[in-house]
């Protein structure tokens, strides 16, 4: 699987999850998030050669098409597969609130 | 929606579904498919600027990050959203068989 366990341990050029740290205030302008100050959102990147973690029949077909037609511009793209939530602390005035934000952290990628 | 109705009628540079005809024999080397000879598989391509048909909170966050950090290499990618099946006719010996192949035709795209 093209997950953090594999991708963070290997120098993988093809589609894989890459580490990306986002600082809420500096990178997003979100002053309202109190904790954490930032988090590893990660992202997916890298070429999608034929059959690499293909998501659907279409991405398999497109990968094969691309292999047999190297000049073609149509190819699958490396995108998130599994995402996890992030728990944050913010304040409503002086009152602390805890919220779970869904689909914030990429754990693995696929060719789609 | 970034679907065929919209994308095929507009000269859209950003993420959109594009027409792609695949000939089973010539483009894939699939001699076993009798009918159709080919089909419009289509594909997704084009930049994913901030907030364009974002798929998840992560892709929205990544788009926002990319907007505020233009030098960043991390950005969402244009991939299939809705896919449709394709019905094909093939032969097992002299016996015709009809099969529905799932997820063969891209109908719309998203930024993921």
């Amino acid at each position: 699987a093209l997950d953090t366990n594999y991708c963070f341990r290997n120098l993988e050029e093809n589609c894989c999850v890459r580490p990306l740290y986002i600082d809420f205030r500096q990178d997003l302008g979100w002053k309202w998030v109190h904790e954490p100050k930032g988090y590893y959102a990660n992202f997916c990147s890298g070429p999608c050669p034929y059959l690499r973690s293909a998501d659907t029949t279409h991405s398999t077909v497109l990968g094969l098409y691309n292999t047999l037609n190297p000049e073609a511009s149509a190819s699958p793209c490396c995108v998130p597969q599994d995402l996890e939530p992030l728990t944050i602390l913010y304040y409503v005035g002086r009152t602390p609130k805890v919220e779970q934000l869904s689909n914030m952290v990429v754990k693995s990628c696929k060719c789609s | 929606a970034l679907d065929t109705n919209y994308c095929f009628r507009n000269l859209e540079e950003n993420c959109c579904v594009r027409p792609l005809y695949i000939d089973f024999r010539q483009d894939l080397g699939w001699k076993w498919v009798h009918e159709p000879k080919g089909y419009y598989a289509n594909f997704c391509s084009g930049p994913c600027p901030y907030l364009r048909s974002a798929d998840t909170t992560h892709s929205t966050v990544l788009g926002l990050y990319n907007t505020l950090n233009p030098e960043a290499s991390a950005s969402p990618c244009c991939v299939p959203q809705d896919l449709e099946p394709l019905t094909i006719l093939y032969y097992v010996g002299r016996t015709p068989k009809v099969e529905q192949l799932s997820n063969m035709v891209v109908k719309s795209c998203k930024c993921s």
Partner: antibody
Amino acid sequence: QVQLVQSGAEVKKPGSSVKVSCKASGYTFSSNVISWVRQAPGKGLQWVGGVIPIVDIANYAQRFKGRVTLTADTSTNTVYMELSNLRTEDTAVYYCARTLGLVLDAMDYWGQGTLVTVSS
Amino acid sequence: ETVLTQSPGTLSLSPGERATLSCRASQSLGSSYLAWYQQKPGQAPRLLIYGASSRAPGVPARFSGSGSGTDFTLTISSLEPEDFAVYYCQQYADSPITFGQGTKLEIK
């Protein structure tokens, strides 16, 4: 420059609903919280609630809970306020306003206001 | 909820004079959860002061805010003709946000 442009005036019957829009431009929409404040004719200001774009976290004044829904459409940089089960005392000018950054905060830019009239 | 009481209800002064507007909270707001706004007829409120004493961008230096706890003051050092309006204080320490009933500053 920062602008908040609201939808036009509405006349509604008691018991019905109204949805007011507020389109933001001139700044990074998803970086700021949007609050809604109303002002009855000749009266003071009353906070309705606020919403955080992207994550759609909304906070409401207790008196409006269950009747008001605040949502943000990040694809169009637009925030919506829907108020249901309208009463005549809901007749007011409704303003959207950008906060300085926190969920509860001072508000530095305001929309032009939308007059909602509730009358039978 | 936190009740804000503004005084006086109406203040009659002449251009060039000093205006002092008061805002009292029913419970302590600390030192940084109070804002002041100016509103003219038919217009949206305009932010003047936030954090009790910080001037918003573009606000003239004649406007100043002070105070902490339960007592806050907006001072206009020398009134200009365009300053005659209604002034509201707002607290954002606790939900719900609340506003004072307003002080009308009118020309004497």
